[in-house]
Amino acid sequence: RAPRCRELPAQKWWHTGALYRIGDLQAFQGHGAGNLAGLKGRLDYLSSLKVKGLVLGPIHKNQKDDVAQTDLLQIDPNFGSKEDFDSLLQSAKKKSIRVILDLTPNYRGENSWFSTQVDTVATKVKDALEFWLQAGVDGFQVRDIENLKDASSFLAEWQNITKGFSEDRLLIAGTNSSDLQQILSLLESNKDLLLTSSYLSDSGSTGEHTKSLVTQYLNATGNRWCSWSLSQARLLTSFLPAQLLRLYQLMLFTLPGTPVFSYGDEIGLDAAALPGQPMEAPVMLWDESSFPDIPGAVSANMTVKGQSEDPGSLLSLFRRLSDQRSKERSLLHGDFHAFSAGPGLFSYIRHWDQNERFLVVLNFGDVGLSAGLQASDLPASASLPAKADLLLSTQPGREEGSPLELERLKLEPHEGLLLRFPYAA
């Protein structure tokens, strides 16, 4: 008799793919634009990325450092009207893109949470949650929670409001902290909270270090759902050299949890290449005319248009990974097992029951390496075959679909491999 199928876990929409942050509407849309009506016109692009949710804003009225002039129920007229927002919500729903609203109160000011008036601000947030839930948003984000006194209890209260309205609503909290203990203490009292942090931001050094960070995090958080990013708001290029961007895309899309990206991560948008542009929100490079301040700074291969036409581009890789992440059971909710593959490498298996399984091997180093995959580290339920088919490599030149002998696996510098193999009883 065939073995019984394992029961599928309950899956929320944010479990099924990536979230895409647009923290600065004006920078995202470019010169002379930057409103909700314009963003509506970019939803097809978001659909092409196969992202499941858009984390938007903040877009509320906020006069820098002035609580009285901060209204979480009102959209800043520079971004548009409530009607524009409703229209954006409707269009996004039609395209199966959920909208998460950032309600970080004092986003234009020095302290995001007006440190001296915590209770006033907390009440404003509570009212805002109820108002925007009624308006149809799918969730909320609050950032810089390390600046919020008694963050855990406030988050628990806001989580109750959000989940009380519907189990299908999400609360995301962001912190600049990279300290695991601080992160765990925030998670402890908030069961379904999705937390973005700087935990992985210094992981770029070696495969061993990244492996230990990831496994420590997963062990510490047990069976709760995680999110993966390098920070609560910033671009990957703020932390990574260009040669590691592909590797990190592959990793973030294949770890167990929700990958969270900032606009521009899909093309390797880098503020440092655009003199004068703010590190936290450089202008999005749609095409070569997107940065007219210094035209010579932008070449076609840095833009959405140029990369869309190149199957070997970072954007093309992002789209492929996003597609795989949203349709393969083993990547959607499969078990995770990291194992040794040799110095400089990080490797793991994702598997779910009798579904197709995935092997990820990442070379963080700047020299080519032979992978010594230590299958003995793996439980019987996740054993390695002799060969696996190459689904994709982060580097050009490999023949996709071809079977690779796992004992003879060699990786180029900064190369990541995604391999697939069938379940074997």
Epitope: H31, G32, Q277, P278, P292
Partner: antibody
Framework: QVQLVQSGAEVKKPGASVKVSCKAS????????MHWVRQAPGQGLEWMGI????????SYAQKFQGRVTMTRDTSTSTVYMELSSLRSEDTAVYYC??????????????????WGQGTMVTVSS | DIVMTQSPDSLAVSLGERATINCKSS????????????LAWYQQKPGQPPKLLIY???TRESGVPDRFSGSGSGTDFTLTISSLQAEDVAVYYC?????????FGQGTRLEIK
């Protein structure tokens, strides 16, 4: 009126560092990018880099990478340029210069509508 | 880097006469998306900082006398002073802002004949 006022002349030994300040007044400090341009005695103009006073992001000419640091203090509307590991070839007048800003389009092309009076830095043993 | 070359290095012109300074860039500074030339001209008098005269190759900065005009496109540009005045004695620089590093011409010294 709009003006940029720079700190006074400096004499430094080779290997030392110099920090030049530039105080802006008469306009919204964070709305305009600031640049540093130097001019060696009897020579032409040489662009060193840019700072965005709003967020503090910087971009330096390759030639000065690793030796120059541009910072700003929004509370006093002042930008600073520090040049380290000085050598005799760094003897020059150092200017801060405000980048143009088109309020209508929001564009900031890099030409300079307001200049500081200049700071003479002499590097000599 | 874009190299800017001015000619002549120095120029002597009689009062009331026309003065012409040329500037050539090593690559085009015309941006096809907005059809603008990313070129500026400055005047620098002894002991003073440079002063902006012209930007976008031909737009005069406010307060600059209309005897100053700029022309040209692509790689070849000209600054013209239609009728030289005594106060125009200075060094003139062209500058490209099409790409970083921002670069200047070596300067043209203008004197009275």
């Amino acid at each position: 009126q709009v003006q940029l006022v720079q700190s006074g002349a400096e004499v430094k030994k080779p290997g030392a560092s110099v920090k030049v300040s530039c105080k802006a007044s008469g306009y919204t400090f964070t709305s305009y990018y600031m640049h540093w341009v130097r001019q060696a005695p009897g020579q032409g103009l040489e662009w060193m880099g840019i700072i965005n006073p709003s967020g503090g992001s910087t971009s330096y000419a390759q030639k000065f990478q690793g030796r120059v640091t541009m910072t700003r203090d929004t509370s006093t509307s002042t930008v600073y340029m520090e040049l380290s590991s000085l050598r005799s070839e760094d003897t020059a007048v150092y200017y801060c210069a405000r980048g143009y800003y088109d309020i209508l389009t929001g564009s900031r092309p890099i030409f300079f509508d307001i200049w500081g009076q200049g700071t003479m830095v002499t590097v000599s043993s | 880097d874009i190299v800017m070359t001015q000619s002549p290095d120095s120029l002597a012109v009689s009062l009331g006469e026309r003065a012409t300074i040329n500037c050539k860039s090593s690559q085009s500074v015309l941006y096809s998306s907005n059809n603008k030339n990313y070129l500026a001209w400055y005047q620098q008098k002894p002991g003073q900082p440079p002063k902006l005269l012209i930007y976008w190759a031909s737009t005069r900065e406010s307060g600059v006398p209309d005897r100053f005009s700029g022309s040209g496109s692509g790689t070849d540009f000209t600054l013209t002073i239609s009728s030289l005045q005594a106060e125009d004695v200075a060094v003139y620089y062209c500058q490209q802002y099409y790409n970083t590093p921002i670069t200047f011409g070596q300067g043209t010294r203008l004197e009275i004949k």
